[in-house]
Interface confidence: low
């Protein structure tokens, strides 16, 4: 009985972009300005997201889909659906509570976002360091020391002086 009733529900005929208006005898009414319904059979329309401040509009709201935001230059998106914008830093830096700071020795960041990370430890994979790491680049691992021809040298990266992202103590 329940299933039959739901199949006959007049609201199920209301397409996306409309809502089933109880105040008007369940007539399908268009979503008001700045609102949308992305599926049929909705009893209300959702308010469109507004991209303000550091957010900018990537896709305008329509009657059937919400607006999509991204971030103004110098910022990048975080979270599902770009729920937040965070300041960019340069490569070789990380964002701290005090702003952008250079990566500590033994760590790198090859992106404008995120944290400084420790150089790859080539020896864990039985390899040697072909190219030293920098603040902007990870070390490059090469063949294992045993695979190197006699007389060839390999560079071993020094241990990090301290780890990235320390809290101010």
């Amino acid at each position: 009985f329940e299933r039959t009733r739901s199949l006959q529900d007049p609201c199920s005929n209301c397409p996306a972009g409309t809502f089933c208006d109880n105040n008007r005898n369940q007539i399908c009414s268009p979503c008001p300005p700045n609102s949308f319904s992305s599926a049929g059979g909705q009893r209300t329309c959702d308010i469109c997201r507004q991209c303000k401040g550091v957010f900018r509009t990537r896709k305008e709201c329509s009657s059937t889909s919400n607006a999509e935001c991204d971030c103004t230059p110098g910022f990048h998106c975080l979270g599902a659906g770009c729920s937040m914008c965070e300041q960019d830093c340069k490569q070789g830096q990380e964002l701290t509570k005090k702003g952008c700071k250079d990566c500590c020795f033994g760590t790198f960041n090859d992106q404008k976002r995120g944290i400084c990370r420790p150089w790859t430890n080539c020896s864990l994979d039985g390899k040697s360091v072909l190219v030293n790491g920098t603040k902007e680049r990870d070390v490059v691992c090469g063949p294992s020391p045993a695979d190197l021809s006699p007389g060839a040298s390999s560079v071993t990266p020094p241990a990090p002086a301290r780890e990235p992202g320390h809290s101010p103590q």
Epitope: G79, A80, T96, K97, Q111, R113, R117, T120, G165, S167
Partner: antibody
Framework: EVQLVESGAEVKKPGASVKVSCKAS????????MHWVRQAPGQGLEWMGW????????NYAQKFQGRVTMTRDTSTSTVYMELSSLRSEDTAVYYC?????????WGQGTMVTVSS | QPVLTQPASVSGSPGQSITISCTGT?????????VSWYQQHPGKAPKLMIY???NRPSGVSDRFSGSKSGNTASLTISGLQAEDEADYYC???????????FGGGTKLTVL
């Protein structure tokens, strides 16, 4: 829409290997590290390692060193996690998760069952 | 064994406030501001609720807040609602070879 879509459930025998994929969409694939985190039935979350999709560099938890390999294919915006020498205690849901300084986007999870 | 210690369970009535603790060491929670909290409903993937100790992603209710003192981080949920019932995990960056660690999880029951 930003999302991570993982491959389907797997059933493996002890000693075998499994390779799980995680396809990213809706953002710049090479701009964010990707991690793998697993969760055994009824248990907590366990970090396995990360891959830098930009360089291919990896960092694995000590527990998984020698058994796990993380790779990426930038042409398809996909990361892979291969775990070898499977044992029954590897039965778990395996999640990929995007990272900036926390895991802000997660895949839906891939159930891997190891059973003889 | 989880590296970060959380209570196995906490409970509260609707409208109340609860706090979940997450105790680590000077190698993880005590040294880094990269502490995050995740909510996980049964059969679902975890969801980020708090990052960088106390920052809340937009879309997450302001009833959720985070803090840290020494080696212990805390998640506080005020005005408990039925939908808050879930497992909660803390996580921190660490200086050990395991770069990220999780707590064992706390089951929150809304009475």
């Amino acid at each position: 829409e930003v999302q991570l879509v993982e491959s389907g459930a797997e059933v493996k025998k002890p000693g075998a290997s499994v390779k799980v994929s995680c396809k990213a969409s809706g953002y710049t694939f090479t701009g964010y590290y990707m991690h793998w985190v697993r969760q055994a039935p009824g248990q907590g979350l366990e970090w396995m390692g990360w891959i830098n999709p930009n360089s291919g560099g990896t960092n694995y938890a000590q527990k998984f060193q020698g058994r796990v390999t993380m790779t990426r294919d930038t042409s398809t915006s996909t990361v892979y996690m291969e775990l070898s020498s499977l044992r029954s205690e590897d039965t778990a849901v395996y999640y990929c998760a995007r990272d900036i300084r926390a895991f802000d986007i997660w895949g839906q999870g891939t159930m891997v069952t190891v059973s003889s | 064994q989880p590296v970060l210690t959380q209570p196995a369970s906490v409970s509260g009535s609707p409208g109340q406030s609860i706090t979940i603790s997450c105790t680590g060491t000077s190698s993880d929670v005590g040294s880094y501001n990269f502490v995050s909290w995740y909510q996980q409903h049964p059969g679902k993937a975890p969801k980020l609720m708090i990052y960088d100790v106390s920052n809340r992603p937009s879309g997450v209710s302001d009833r959720f807040s985070g803090s840290k003192s020494g080696n212990t981080a805390s998640l506080t949920i005020s005005g408990l609602q039925a939908e808050d019932e879930a497992d909660y995990y803390c996580s921190s960056y660490t200086s050990s070879s395991t770069r990220w660690v999780f707590g064992g999880g706390t089951k929150l029951t809304v009475l």
